[in-house]
């Protein structure tokens, strides 16, 4: 399929001028190669009326120009002075006329309207409202008022001052009388129909004296806007209808075969399946405007799409509306990542999220989507050491790999989980990505102590089994913080038999910490990676006490009865107001969030010397200070 | 469930060497997943720690009360965990109880989870 895109269908009438942008997939070959714009013949070939070259055909001299903006992908072709002759089958493209790489664009100029004199025209969109004035002498100021559609060779009534009101008008129109003093009265149409368009005369009085005026309405179906984005990107859809539909239901629908447009979302909270996960209606404005935020582009959601007002959230008769066709550009700048991350209960995930590289200074953030009413994305993570309360000590963003991508990690998984979460940045907002994270049965391939508590003084030794399959990954434990997972020294003490069918490849490595003080409370984790790309996590939380006086009895003795494997995690989770994404500039513009960034440091850690009495009696205690 | 079993308690005299074993079954994970401990309690009295042992035994840990007298070790081989106790004194006659960990650590409270029934030690003067 070519990348090149453009508009399929130009309307126009003699005598005006059209402008016609293609867009292409802004590479540096592209950027500098030959553009064209041609005419199909009967028989195939395509002849070239206008080139970046400088070529212009004599058909268009004098009244044609074609521009190249090569920093946004983009070419646009000018031409005046049209004439019906200049109809039929064009092709924008790139390189050589034969080569494919091309749109093809319909031009379809039509013959102005043949008017009669005194003829006011009324030029109105699709939806909107159009008010027709029609003045009239004083000897007819008291009598009948009437406004006629011309249908073929006769006028049909559409309203008058006696009540009438033709079906086909009903609940959308009024006929206004002005005060005494105006000699005018008007005709007010709401919620235009393309059906409405035609020839109109308003009359007042219905004898020889009576003043007649002619109305020409043009009701404009809206040209779509032409949007041009990547496979796996994002698009925003800004919908603007105007303040006289700020109440009324907002939908976005995509059209299907014929006039059908199936809702892709709306204020109703209608979300279609396919957009699950991936869609945000963004609050309406004061002044009725909205946008829509898809990810995850697929190729099947190039195509038309159109936003617009009605009370049933869908589109009907008589709707405003805005219009865009999208081309998802298969050639993407954006790279495969998986779009499913499946982890198993108490586990781990670690989710690869790109970036625009250029943008590497900018903020990175995760949040989670939810559906609920018209969709929004609390965030969850930044990359400036904000990590929503509720997950503390299990979620991590990473800087690593760099290049292009960041790495968020959360561990601890429960169903609850399960779900789709947003990659983004305060950057490009077209690199925004979806994964969606499936809660699987299984067991955990780390295997960690449950809750830990480290005496004041002392030294704790916490283990983490890692099976076999992870013999050819670097294991490593670190402290968190909402900055990240700082690395502490650990120690493999050779083979774990935590593991059934597991030979010596499978590993125990211990962190020890050495003469625990208060801030070597927190979570720990143990994990795996490869390089810079993280695996499976496992989270331990330490509490530290004060030692016991001599003789008093250890809590931890009570709980004899504990299986070995429970996990008890800190619940004392403090709730916060959300920081949800609900309009994409937001992270253009502020952060409103204060800085919880984690001060505390000087956690201990050590390598244990593995001497048999180590601490019963020898002084050798090892201090890392970070 | 981890089932720990003690062996080798009986009478001795003062000043006599015994040796104490736990033998671990039914795990939920490997004996080397435990770090291992020893506890004791004399009639009258509370249950007191005695030493303790990490998991691949490359720490240890004794009350001062037992210290250069006793040595912890295991076999992670054969899931054993033994104590062995020299220069026994009168103040010794206790029951002496075996207990598991998931983590070690070094002072005189181990997170214990899961106990022994118990072997009796008497050291007669």
């Known amino acids: 399929k070519s990348p090149i895109f453009g508009p399929e269908e130009v309307n126009s009438v003699e005598g005006n001028s059209v402008s016609i942008t293609c867009y292409y997939p802004p590479t540096s070959v592209n950027r500098h190669t030959r553009k064209y714009w041609c005419r199909q013949g009967a028989r195939g070939g395509c002849i070239t009326l206008i080139s970046s070259e400088g070529y212009v055909s004599s058909k268009y001299a004098g009244r044609a120009n074609l521009t190249n903006f090569p920093e946004n992908g983009t070419f646009v072709v000018n031409i005046a002075q049209l004439s019906q002759d200049d109809s039929g089958r064009y092709k924008c493209g790139l390189g050589i006329n034969s080569r494919g790489l091309s749109f093809d664009v319909s031009l379809e100029v039509s013959q102005g309207p043949g008017l009669l004199n005194d003829t006011k025209v009324y030029t109105v969109d699709l939806g909107r409202t159009v008010t027709i004035n029609c003045p009239f002498k004083t000897e007819n100021a008291q009598k009948r008022k009437s406004l006629y559609k011309q249908i073929g060779l006769y006028p049909v009534l559409v309203i008058d001052s006696s009540g009438y009101v033709n079906p086909n008008y009903t609940g959308r129109i009024r006929l206004d009388i002005q005060g005494t003093g105006q000699l005018l009265f008007s005709v007010v149409i709401n919620q235009l129909r393309l059906s409405d368009a035609g020839q109109y005369l308003c009359q007042a009085g219905d004898d020889s004296n009576s003043n007649k005026k002619n109305a020409d309405l043009q009701v404009l179906k809206p040209e779509p806007e032409l949007v041009y984005e990547d496979l796996r990107g994002s698009v925003t859809f800004h919908c603007a209808l105007g303040p006289e539909v700020a109440n009324v239901a907002k939908f976005l629908c995509r059209q299907s075969s014929g006039e059908n447009c199936d809702v892709v979302v709306n204020t109703l909270g209608k979300r279609a399946p396919a957009f699950e996960g991936r869609i945000l209606l963004n609050p309406q404005d004061k002044d009725g405007s909205f946008s829509v935020v898809i990810t995850g582009l697929r190729k099947e959601d190039a195509g038309r799409y159109l936003c617009g007002a009605h009370s049933d959230g869908q589109l009907q008769e008589g709707s405003p509306i805005q219009a865009w066709q999208l081309f998802v550009n298969e050639e993407s700048t954006i790279p495969r990542s998986p779009t499913v991350v499946k982890g198993v209960a108490g586990s781990s995930v670690a989710v690869l999220c790109p970036y625009n590289r250029k943008e590497s200074k900018s903020i990175k953030y995760w949040c989670l989507w939810e559906g609920a009413q018209n969709g929004r994305c609390p965030l969850l993570v930044d990359s400036e050491g904000w990590v929503k309360a509720q997950y503390e000590g299990r979620l991590s963003l990473l800087e690593e790999p760099g290049n292009g991508t960041f790495t968020v990690i959360l561990n601890q998984l429960t169903s609850r989980d399960a779900g789709f979460y947003w990659c983004l940045t305060n950057g490009d907002t077209l690199w925004r990505t979806t994964v969606e994270i499936k809660i699987i049965e299984g067991e955990p391939n780390l295997k960690v102590p449950g809750n830990v508590t480290a005496v004041l003084g002392e030294t704790l030794k916490v283990p983490c089994h890692f099976p076999c399959k992870f013999s050819s990954y670097e294991k490593y434990w670190c402290k968190w913080n909402n900055t990240g997972c700082q690395a502490l020294p650990s120690q493999d003490e050779g083979p774990s038999k935590a593991f059934v069918n597991c030979d010596e490849n499978s590993r125990l490595v211990s962190l020890t910490l050495n003469l625990v003080t208060r801030a070597d409370e927190g979570w720990y984790w143990c994990g795996v990676k490869q390089g810079h790309f993280y695996g499976e996590t496992a989270a331990v939380y330490v509490a530290v006490e004060e030692r016991k006086a001599a003789g008093s009895r250890d809590v931890s003795l009570a709980k004899a009865d504990a299986a070995p494997d429970e996990k008890v995690l800190d619940s004392g989770f403090r709730e916060i107001e959300n920081k949800a994404i609900q309009d994409p500039r937001l992270f253009a513009e502020e952060k409103a969030v204060a800085d919880t960034r984690d001060q505390a440091d000087g956690s201990r850690a050590s390598v244990d010397s593995g001497s048999s009495e180590e601490q019963g009696g020898s002084s050798r205690h090892h201090h890392h200070h970070h | 469930q981890v089932q720990l079993v003690e062996s080798g308690g009986g009478l001795v005299q003062a000043g006599d060497s015994l040796r104490l074993s736990c033998a671990a079954s039914g795990r939920a994970l490997s004996f080397n997943t435990y770090a291992m401990a020893w506890f004791r309690q004399a009639p009258g009295k509370e249950r007191e720690f005695v030493a303790s042992i990490t998991y691949n035994g490359g720490s240890t840990y004794y009350a001062d009360s037992v210290k250069g007298r006793f040595t912890v070790t295991r076999d992670n081989g054969k899931d054993t965990v033994t104590l062995r106790m020299n220069s026994l004194k009168p103040d010794d006659t206790a029951v002496y109880y075996c207990?598991?960990?998931?983590?070690?650590?070094?002072?005189?409270?181990?997170?214990?989870?899961?106990w022994g029934q118990g072997t009796l030690v008497t050291v007669s003067s």
């Open positions: 207990a598991s960990a998931q983590y070690w650590r070094s002072g005189t409270s181990f997170p214990a989870n899961y």
